[in-house]
Amino acid sequence: CDLPQTHSLGNRRALILLGQMGRISPFSCLKDRHDFRIPQEEFDGNQFQKAQAISVLHEMIQQTFNLFSTEDSSAAWEQSLLEKFSTELYQQLNDLEACVIQEVGVEETPLMNEDSILAVRKYFQRITLYLIERKYSPCAWEVVRAEIMRSLSFSTNLQKRLRRKD
């Protein structure tokens, strides 16, 4: 499955939108930094078969979509930017779902992939727990926004590596 060029453009657009969503100066939030233990090894495309990598990407985008689709998220961000961001993610999910169906038929996805998906889910659980603990404060959301920008950048790099493998 070849991810369309529009997919990587969508990823870039999503990153730009997320960059524009900040409402407060991040400089006031330094003390709120937190180690979410991003599962970096899951974004290393070299150790995966293509089907596995696409599944991990899909889980990453799905969890990001879920995180920014909550009521608490709606209250935190400017509505029109949030809607555009969610639309970009939704389009990426559609692209990836088509690929997941295509690729899983070609390769058997081993249990290792379930571990990778679980690692991504646990990562987002840590992010959600942090937001709950910080009572969804503006600074907590600002820290999460920075973290998601970082993980989306990792996703973009993984997609680039997948394209080079084709």
Partner: antibody, heavy 121, light 107 residues
Framework: EVQLVQSGAEVKKPGESLKISCKGS????????IGWVRQMPGKGLEWMGI????????AYSPSFQGQVTISADKSISTAYLQWSSLKASDTAMYYC??????????????WGQGTLVTVSS | DIQMTQSPSSLSASVGDRVTITCRAS??????LNWYQQKPGKAPKLLIY???SLQSGVPSRFSGSGSGTDFTLTISSLQPEDFATYYC?????????FGQGTKVEIK
């Protein structure tokens, strides 16, 4: 390879203006903040201020607020430190360094080589 | 502003010695403390971040510990290339502040 390359040494007279630069390469320039640190001859490190190149938001140390201006041009991956009217006490080595912002990652992990500014009549 | 106080301001040691430098913050900074090494005429180099995380490429003889207000940098066995000035820096809040430095000299 991540690099921060600073502009060359400057010799100026009191009252003159100056703008020194710090060019980032080998990483996404807008994904990191750039901080500026002063070191006067034979003295320790003093944090001056910081900029987020993605939107040019800045924060200054109270000691340097109003004394210097920090700016950035993300199109050429360059941050700047400028003075409108230099004093002899501005004589120092100035370093830029990158900062991961709100991400949990090493602070000031890469530094420029420093720009020596000498102000003398 | 958060004040950072290092001790000692200088020390003399021999190759192979265990060296300990302490840093105290004027208020709690959790674990948001970094340690840097600077050699004459060179830019500072990050050694330890978030109190105890070893920066990539830094030898394991360097270690950091502490949280709250009291922090320690330890060099387990001093090497010739370790003679330098060491700075702590709080990364908890703006304005960021450095300790005054500890110069490690050859005995």
């Amino acid at each position: 390879e991540v690099q921060l390359v600073q502009s060359g040494a400057e010799v100026k007279k009191p009252g003159e203006s100056l703008k020194i630069s710090c060019k980032g390469s080998g990483y996404s320039f807008t994904s990191y903040w750039i901080g500026w640190v002063r070191q006067m001859p034979g003295k320790g490190l003093e944090w001056m201020g910081i900029i987020d190149p993605s939107d040019s938001d800045t924060a200054y140390s109270p000691s340097f607020q109003g004394q210097v201006t920090i700016s950035a041009d993300k199109s050429i991956s360059t941050a700047y430190l400028q003075w409108s009217s230099l004093k002899a006490s501005d004589t120092a080595m100035y370093y830029c360094a990158r900062h991961p912002g709100l991400n949990w990652a090493p602070d000031f992990d890469y530094w420029g080589q420093g720009t020596l500014v000498t102000v003398s009549s | 502003d958060i004040q950072m106080t290092q001790s000692p301001s200088s020390l003399s040691a021999s190759v192979g010695d265990r060296v300990t430098i302490t840093c105290r913050a004027s208020q709690s900074i959790d674990g948001a403390l970094n340690w840097y090494q600077q050699k004459p005429g060179k830019a500072p180099k990050l050694l330890i971040y978030f109190a105890s995380s070893l920066q990539s490429g830094v030898p394991s003889r360097f270690s950091g510990s502490g949280s709250g207000t009291d922090f320690t940098l330890t060099i387990s066995s001093l090497q010739p290339e370790d003679f330098a000035t060491y700075y702590c820096q709080q990364a908890y809040d703006f304005p960021l502040t450095f300790g005054q430095g500890t110069k490690v000299e050859i005995k």
